[in-house]
């Protein structure tokens, strides 16, 4: 007769491993007992269990509650056992020794490989700013046994690079995603996708991109020159810009302090009923943590009693 077993048995961490050991003998041959031991335990084998045809299963204290026989129906020539809830420390070499009558003793070895699913982590790169060159947006690292696959899922244009380090039968894989930051990428998702034989489905970690930028500033409100005349109510200037982080606005008058009654409300400068004193050069200063921009406009308030036209000059500066 001969023993039938597997060269390598593979199990996912936390699942049950079947360690096969089947005696294929001639008719009339019987299996008296099957002894299972850890064969790579250093000095002397570490016993797992003894399977006796008459007295049943005896499990050694170190494996109490973790070794069982497969569920019925059982073949008396089958010395296979189940190792419950496999952990990484179970990975290694196992030996079954089968005592038969009348053929004598047989032994076989198998190797148990425990697949360890990865726990991926995503680390954002340095702050992204418009105008930078190729910049690290994020890196994603996953370690498992065997090596995980790390890829990226995103609409954003970029380049990836990977590096791996092997550690015995596990491996750590790091993938980096580089891009040239632009404001259009703001709020876009960048998803790290990790695949592994021990995972039922891919693991996904999403990072939302934030790109710092500040658009050119401009001022609205002076489009219709005829509206800026003495006595007009509700006149206002609005400063237009866009940024990430959202910018703050500040209004000043270049040729003196803001006239009394002029209200600053964020990006808007509100005027009381217009007088010629409101004529002047007004500056909108836009800033965020990334940059600052200025836009200035010249306001000429028309006095209908004077026979002169109103002039408006718009000047932008950064």
């Amino acid at each position: 007769g001969e023993l039938e077993t597997s060269d390598v048995v593979t199990v996912v961490l936390g699942q049950d491993a079947k360690l096969p050991c089947f005696y294929r003998g001639d008719s009339g041959e019987q299996v008296g007992q099957v002894a299972w031991a850890r064969a790579d335990a250093g000095e002397g084998a570490q016993e797992l269990a003894l399977l006796h045809s008459k007295y049943g299963l005896h499990v050694s204290p170190a494996y109490e509650g973790r070794v069982e026989q497969p569920p019925p129906p059982r073949n008396p020539l089958d010395g296979s056992v189940l190792l419950r809830n496999a952990v990484q420390a179970d990975e290694g070499e196992y030996e079954c020794r089968v005592s038969t009558f009348p053929a004598g003793s047989f032994q076989a070895r198998l190797r148990l490989r425990v697949l360890v699913p990865p726990l991926p982590s995503l680390n954002p790169g340095p702050a992204l700013e418009e105008g930078q060159g190729l910049t690290l947006a994020a890196s994603c690292t996953a370690e498992g046994s065997p090596a995980p696959s790390v890829t990226w899922d995103t609409e954003v244009k970029g380049t990836t690079s990977s590096r791996s380090f092997k550690h015995s039968r596990s491996a750590a894989v790091t993938s980096e995603f580089h891009l040239v930051p632009s404001r259009s990428m703001n709020g876009q998702p960048l998803t790290c996708v990790v695949s592994h034989p021990g995972l039922l489905q891919d693991q996904r970690i999403t990072h939302i991109l934030h790109v710092s930028f500040l658009a050119e500033a401009s001022v609205r409100g002076l489009e219709d020159q005829n509206l800026w005349h003495v006595g007009r109510e509700g006149a206002m200037l609005k400063c237009l810009s866009e940024g990430q982080p959202p910018p703050s606005y500040n209004w000043t008058r270049l040729d003196g302090p803001l006239p009394s009654g002029v209200r600053v409300d964020g990006d808007t400068l509100g005027f009381p009923p217009l007088t010629t004193e409101h004529s002047g050069i007004y500056v909108c200063h836009v800033s965020n943590e990334f940059s600052s921009r200025d836009s200035q406009v010249t306001v000429d308030v028309l006095d209908p009693q004077e026979d002169s036209g109103k002039q408006v000059d718009l000047v932008s500066a950064s």
């Epitope: 597997s6 060269d7 390598v8 593979t10 790579d40 250093g42 990484q88 420390a89 290694g92 070499e93 190797r111 490989r113 065997p146 090596a147 696959s149 791996s164 380090f165 092997k166 550690h167 015995s168 039968r169 491996a171 894989v173 034989p197």
Partner: antibody
């Protein structure tokens, strides 16, 4: 019987290419990480590359970008594609199986890089 | 990268006497999660491929005579041949398989005095 048999060695000029093969038998090839290790005459052992069970690959700096390891599990075969060969690559090349350390080795195939 | 350094480079020992080879790694090869040292010892005889003797620093490979033993942890390791036999004449290498790039020691040649 567990066995590894290398082939593909030979004489090649500097800058040339060579592809080594390693035929595995007697074990479940797809379940093992595999390696190439080389040894120049009278010198010590130098690790050249490794490939994991899912095709992940590893190289030392001395061969990175020039050598490519691959495997074909259906054919129980391991390969090493060597490009831009240099005189310093002259050695016996062994393929080896890894479990805890490299527990099975082939007999090696000789690569000579010379003009 | 981890550098492995063996000492001595060569060793002459009388038959039946003890031979001791040392191996030092430039950084620890002890994996804390399982308390195993990822260090192996190999024997290479002339014209033959290397043969695995010891793994996890101290576990003998199946079929290796018990006169071979390994010890040590972290960065310092020792291979001991308790009673040198004629067939033990060879070059012995240590190797770390803690992380890539894997690296070997330069080898120690053991001869009979």
């Amino acid at each position: 019987e567990v066995q590894l048999v290398e082939s593909g060695g030979g004489l090649v000029q500097p800058g040339g290419s060579l592809r080594l093969s390693c035929a595995a038998s007697g074990f479940t090839f797809s379940s093992y990480d595999m390696h190439w290790v080389r040894q120049a005459t009278g010198k010590g052992l130098e690790w050249v590359s490794a490939i994991g069970t899912v095709g992940d690959t590893y190289y030392p700096g001395s061969v990175k970008g020039r050598f490519t390891i691959s495997r074909e599990n259906a054919k129980n075969s391991l390969y090493l594609q060597m490009n831009s060969l240099r005189a310093g690559d002259t050695a016996v090349y062994y393929c080896a199986r890894e479990w805890n350390g490299m527990d099975v080795w082939g007999q090696g195939t000789t690569v000579t890089v010379s003009s | 990268d981890i550098v492995m350094t063996q000492s001595p480079d060569s060793l002459a020992v009388s038959l039946g006497e003890r031979a001791t080879i040392n191996c030092k790694s430039s950084q620890s090869v002890l994996y804390n999660s399982n308390n195993k040292n990822y260090l192996a010892w190999y024997q290479q005889k002339p014209g033959q491929p290397p043969k695995l003797l010891i793994y996890w620093a101290s576990t003998r490979e199946s079929g290796v005579p018990d006169r071979f033993s390994g010890s040590g942890s972290g960065t310092d390791f020792t291979l001991t041949i308790s009673s040198l036999q004629a067939e033990d004449v060879a070059v012995y290498y240590c190797q770390q398989f803690y992380t890539t790039p894997y690296s070997f020691g330069q080898g120690t040649k053991v001869e009979i005095k």
